[in-house]
């Protein structure tokens, strides 16, 4: 049972978003008193795996040599010390890309946009999907979800941006996901470069919901405005 021990830290290397077939290592770091580490995967029998600590005993390694759908999901880890089991770590969400073919990302009316104007990024899938994600490269909070409600699936999602400022410029990709699991994503779309022309003195956009109060311009999450054009899709922030 969970004792007063501090919770361990759980992370993945090289990251928590892994392409199908690639290797990933999950690390659980506890204390020097740890005698055993346990990794639990949501909706799987516990424990999912157990490992002895690596010297100097404050962490353990859980290796996945080749990423597949079975490994995608939500993990927590614990460690056991002489006084009992620790509290669970914060969850780690291990996401696999390559589960589905890549969607198509385009900009309407054009990827060249004047500051102060509007642009809509359109992520389209030739087969029906229920979640679309837009990612901006080098953003600290890159994920913006559009998820369909009531299991209704869509062929596309629109991500409107207005007014556009220099902060919106950059490279975007989108992913799509099926209802099987939100931890399984498509291959990434081909990149789309959004080029914002106009004043270099653009004001910072004032987001309707700031994900990180200490974020710099490149860390600002994408802030689309207006209603979601497909009524079956609902906006979800990560």
């Amino acid at each position: 049972q969970a004792g007063p021990l501090p919770k361990p830290t759980l992370w993945a290397e090289p990251g928590s978003v892994i392409s199908w077939g690639n290797s990933v290592t999950i690390w659980c770091q506890g204390t020097l008193e740890a005698r055993e580490y346990r990794l639990d995967k949501e909706e799987s029998p516990a424990p999912w795996d157990r490992q002895n600590p690596l010297e100097p005993k404050n962490k353990a390694r859980f290796s996945i040599p080749s990423m597949t759908e079975d490994y995608a999901g939500r993990y927590r880890c614990y460690y056991r010390s002489p006084v009992g089991w620790s509290q669970p770590s914060d969850p780690l969400e291990l996401v696999m890309t390559g589960a589905y073919s890549k969607p198509t990302l385009s900009a309407l009316p054009s990827p060249l946009v004047t500051s102060g104007k509007s642009v809509t990024l359109l992520c389209q899938s030739r087969s029906p999907m229920d979640t679309f994600l837009l990612i901006k490269e080098r953003a600290a909070h890159p994920l913006l979800h559009l998820r369909s409600e009531h299991g209704a699936q869509q062929h596309q999602a629109e991500f409107p941006m207005s007014p556009v400022t220099s902060v919106h410029g950059g490279t975007y990709r989108c992913f799509s996901s099926h209802g099987f699991s939100h931890y399984l994503l498509s291959h990434p779309s081909d990149p789309l470069e959004l080029i914002v022309s106009g004043s270099l003195e653009d004001p910072r956009p004032s987001p309707t919901r700031s994900v990180s109060t200490a974020a710099g311009p490149e860390d600002q999450p994408l802030m689309p405005t207006g209603s979601v054009p497909h009524s079956g899709l609902r906006r979800h922030w990560e």
Epitope: W20, E69, G98, A99, Y100, S101, R126, H187
Partner: antibody
Amino acid sequence: EVQLVESGGGLVQPGGSLRLSCAASGFSLSSSYWISWVRQAPGKGLEWIGSIDSGSVGITYYATWVKGRFTISRDNSKNTLYLQMNSLRAEDTAVYYCARHGDNWALDLWGQGTLVTVSS
Amino acid sequence: DIQMTQSPSTLSASVGDRVTITCRASQSINSWLAWYQQKPGKAPKLLIYKASTLASGVPSRFSGSGSGTEFTLTISSLQPDDFATYYCQHGYIRGDLDNVFGGGTKVEIK
């Protein structure tokens, strides 16, 4: 050379089964493509049978008329796609093509086709 | 379901003629429409994708236009090699489709 090559066609009796193969070369079936099976009865137009997504999950969709008689599968290790056809009827007599959906959502690569004749 | 209706089903024309084939979708398919040319005993050949983009190696006398539900394939000056059957196809893949192709248009010598 990038190509698709179908095989496995031939004469089969009504009610019988047949498995067609589509071997890909010059590209990987596990990369980001959809592959479709399309057929063409003698003197008729093109008819979509179904498609499989090359992503690891391998989602498949079928034309409404298929009604479970045909199954599309793949073997990534052999870079080959299959069409399993059961309960064949005379009206299934056709040339069967596999074709790749490119980034432009069009069928940019076709096999040469394989003839299936269902007759007693 | 998305139904693709091509017209005419047969078209008689002469070398040098301007030829137009129409494809209508029963609901909007945006610009995800392709056109193919097929000759007897051969696999179809991609001519145009995304409604108006010419595929590699296709002569410039072929052009496509339209979006939403109405699409057109035009051959500006019909050549002897162009007598064939032409098909349109939408790019969506779903489980509620009878077919993704139009019924075809045979272009024959007048």
